[in-house]
């Protein structure tokens, strides 16, 4: 099996407005080197969620809980959720480069919002 | 049991080359990251190379890239390290390691020693 | 380069009592919450064997007594109780996204 996977192991969750949802994933290999970044929808509109390295998100925190060796976790919190965050998610590994490449992509999870 | 032998070690002079090789079982070899790391007396280990499970990446460490070329066969179950233009510095025990995520050095071989002298 | 400093070179501690190794990384080697910081075992004579992966979580096989904890720059590796077999020296490993991924320059433990 080549390379790495992006694991997103739920294909939807559902919170309450106002409450602070988990998105969940897991990488196999570091290897190629790069980074995560997160995402919400597809395609060349999509809105960046989170990226470590960069950028100002302050309803974002990294979850991370792996201790297996198999794996690592890029998991993320957003907090106080409300209708405006509903969407699909990415959790997407790129390689380094100049400028950095989009490597693989996780399947998604769907966030739906749920009234108070 | 994770097994790893390196052979192809030896005395060398300046500006030759050898080639590395290390033999695997005891895992999916085709499924974890492979690397070379060095140790000698005076600069500690070293990283010297890595392989992606299917071998479609490589990375070196400035010291070594263009002189050290890093491949494997899966079929066979074998890491190669082809080293050019040899260096004095380059002298060391040189370690096949491999990695199930390419973050921790997770099992070393024993080790084949280079020594590049005239 | 991330440089990792790590000290001391060498330890004396007496059998049954801790030993402390610390290492600190020139800038922060954490991703998402995961620290890319790992810990060896090197006796002589024998290859270095993994001990602690990711800062904190212990290698199948390795005695309880070893335990890492730290986070961003700064990482500790501690024996407690120190025994015989623990005799040996000992490194830590970055292997952040930026390369090159280096190794501290080893902390000899011996008993007093």
């Known amino acids: 099996e080549e390379e790495l996977q992006v694991i997103q192991p739920d294909k939807s969750v559902s919170v309450a407005a106002g409450e602070s949802a988990i998105l969940h994933c897991t990488v196999t290999s570091l290897i190629p080197v790069g980074p995560i970044q997160w995402f919400r929808g597809a395609g060349p509109a999509r809105e960046l969620i989170y990226n470590q390295k960069e950028g100002h998100f302050p309803r974002v925190t990294t979850v991370s809980e792996s201790t297996k060796r198999e794996n690592m976790d890029f998991s993320i919190s957003i907090s106080n959720i409300t209708p405006a965050d509903a969407g699909t998610y990415y959790c997407v590994k790129f390689r380094k480069g100049s400028p950095d490449t989009e490597f693989k992509s996780g399947a998604g999870t769907e966030l739906s919002v749920r009234a108070k | 049991e994770v097994q790893l032998v390196e052979s192809g070690g030896g005395l060398v002079k300046p500006g030759g080359s050898l080639r590395l090789s290390c033999a695997a079982s005891g895992f999916t070899f085709s499924s974890y990251v492979m690397s070379w790391v060095r140790q000698t007396p005076g600069k500690g280990l070293e990283w010297v190379a890595t392989i992606s499970s299917g071998g479609t990446y490589t990375y070196y460490p400035n010291s070594v890239k263009g002189r050290f070329t890093l491949s494997r066969d899966n079929a066979k179950n074998s890491l190669y390290l082809q080293m050019n233009s040899l260096r004095a510095e380059d002298t060391a025990v040189y370690y096949c390691v491999s990695s199930m995520t390419g973050s921790s050095f997770d099992y070393w071989g024993q080790g084949t020693t280079v020594t590049v002298s005239s | 380069d991330i440089v990792i400093t790590q000290s001391p070179a060498s330890l004396a501690v007496s059998l049954g009592e801790r030993a402390t190794i610390s290492c600190r990384a020139s800038?922060?080697?954490?991703?998402?919450?995961?620290?890319?910081m790992h810990w060896y075992q090197q006796k002589p004579g024998q290859p270095p064997k993994l001990l602690i992966y990711r800062a904190s979580n212990l290698e199948s096989g390795v005695p309880d007594r070893f335990s890492g904890s730290g986070s961003r720059t700064d990482f500790t590796l501690t024996i407690n109780p120190l025994q015989a077999e623990d005799v040996a020296t000992y490194y830590c490993h970055q292997s952040s996204e930026q390369l090159p991924w280096t190794f501290g320059g080893g902390t000899k433990v011996e008993i007093k």
């Open positions: 800038e922060s080697v954490d991703s998402y919450g995961n620290s890319f």
